[in-house]
């Protein structure tokens, strides 16, 4: 049976918490990704940004989980209007910002 949206969001948050807590060396060797506007469509935008990071096992589960939240197919190189123009940040900072935002969504009961 499908996982309730609140459970799915909680599991995604748990995964991001694990990543931030277990981070020893620079996450994904310090790879840079496009910063996004943390507004509507955050899951697809986050996936569109993170999908361009390859060979980083630490975020593979996050990529798969985000894929479950995003209703359309996302492929590398694709980018929506939610990208912050010409701004790149380290994956570690991206994950931290995303985590803060998702925790707020959970606190506010916004699961979809």
């Amino acid at each position: 049976s499908p996982v309730p949206p609140s459970t799915a969001l909680k599991e995604l948050i748990e995964e991001l918490v694990n990543i931030t807590q277990n981070q020893k060396a620079p996450l994904c060797n310090g790879s840079m990704v496009w910063s996004i506007n943390l507004t509507a469509g955050v899951y697809c935008a986050a996936l569109e940004s993170l999908i361009n990071v390859s060979g980083c096992s630490a975020i593979e589960k996050t990529q798969r989980m985000l894929n479950g939240f995003c209703p359309h197919k996302v492929s590398a190189g694709q980018f929506s209007s939610l990208r912050v123009r010409d701004t790149k940040i380290e994956v570690a900072q991206f994950v931290k910002d995303l985590l803060v935002h998702l925790k707020k969504l959970f606190r506010e009961g916004q699961f979809n």
């Epitope: 609140s6 807590q21 959970f106």
Partner: antibody, heavy 125, light 112 residues
Framework: QVQLVQSGAEVKKPGSSVKVSCKAS????????MHWVRQAPGQGLEWMGT????????KYVPKFQGRVTITADESTSTAYMELSSLRSEDTAVYYC??????????????????WGQGTLVTVSS | DVLMTQSPSSLSASVGDRVTITCRSS???????????LEWYQQKPGKAPKLLIY???DRFSGVPSRFSGSGSGTDFTLTISSLQPEDFATYYC?????????FGQGTKLEIK
């Protein structure tokens, strides 16, 4: 260290407006919710509303809707509470407070873990 | 609005006593995300309130272990196992589950 420093005491005439500021340091306000709570002399605490400084979204107590405006300026790490059409029963100490996520738990947003020192607003003709 | 009713409104006790303050909500305060955002605050005259307990029973960092919270649904309790001189203050329960968030009317704890 975490600090919330509020603006000084104000004396206002009925019908006027007051704007109280709350300067944050030691954390990023965009990671938090910022709240405003008031306490009339000898009375209990009353939650007025909150803002998410990351996007400007606000929630207000219906009783204050239309009279209160909560804003935040991320660039100066300052939250503001403006109350208009003041009446004598608005005489109170106004507190700002923050709630922030806990790195070590999945979903904990503390209700209000750090508070400003309070700002006394006196409404008198 | 959710009405939070504390009892008693005032209480006289001695150092070393075990004290229980109760808080009843006018409706169930389980949030849509499954958490119950019930907190307890302590306030001393002329000072800002201090967070003691969040999510019914989680003690905030630095709060002595003599403070504990319990309850579920609509009935909640704050217990001070052995009163210390610095514990004489006013205590407020608070619900952050349903907007508008609301405080109880307070319980003033005085020295007998």
């Amino acid at each position: 260290q975490v600090q919330l420093v509020q603006s000084g005491a104000e004396v206002k005439k009925p019908g006027s407006s007051v704007k109280v500021s709350c300067k944050a340091s030691g954390f990023y306000i965009k990671d938090t919710y910022m709240h405003w709570v008031r306490q009339a002399p000898g009375q209990g605490l009353e939650w007025m509303g909150t803002i998410d400084p990351a996007n400007g979204n606000t929630k207000y107590v219906p009783k204050f809707q239309g009279r209160v405006t909560i804003t935040a300026d991320e660039s100066t790490s300052t939250a503001y509470m403006e109350l208009s059409s003041l009446r004598s029963e608005d005489t109170a100490v106004y507190y700002c407070a923050r709630s922030i996520y806990d790195d070590y738990h999945v979903d904990d947003y503390y209700a209000m873990d750090y508070w400003g020192q309070g700002t006394l607003v006196t409404v008198s003709s | 609005d959710v009405l939070m009713t504390q009892s008693p409104s005032s209480l006289s006790a001695s150092v070393g006593d075990r004290v229980t303050i109760t808080c009843r909500s006018s409706q169930n305060i389980v949030h849509i995300n499954g958490n119950t955002y019930l907190e307890w605050y302590q306030q001393k005259p002329g000072k800002a309130p201090k967070l003691l307990i969040y999510k019914i029973s989680d003690r905030f960092s630095g709060v002595p272990s003599r403070f504990s919270g319990s309850g579920s649904g609509t009935d909640f309790t704050l217990t001070i196992s052995s009163l210390q001189p610095e514990d004489f203050a006013t205590y407020y329960c608070f619900q952050g589950s349903h907007v508008p968030w609301t405080f109880g009317q307070g319980t003033k704890l005085e020295i007998k």
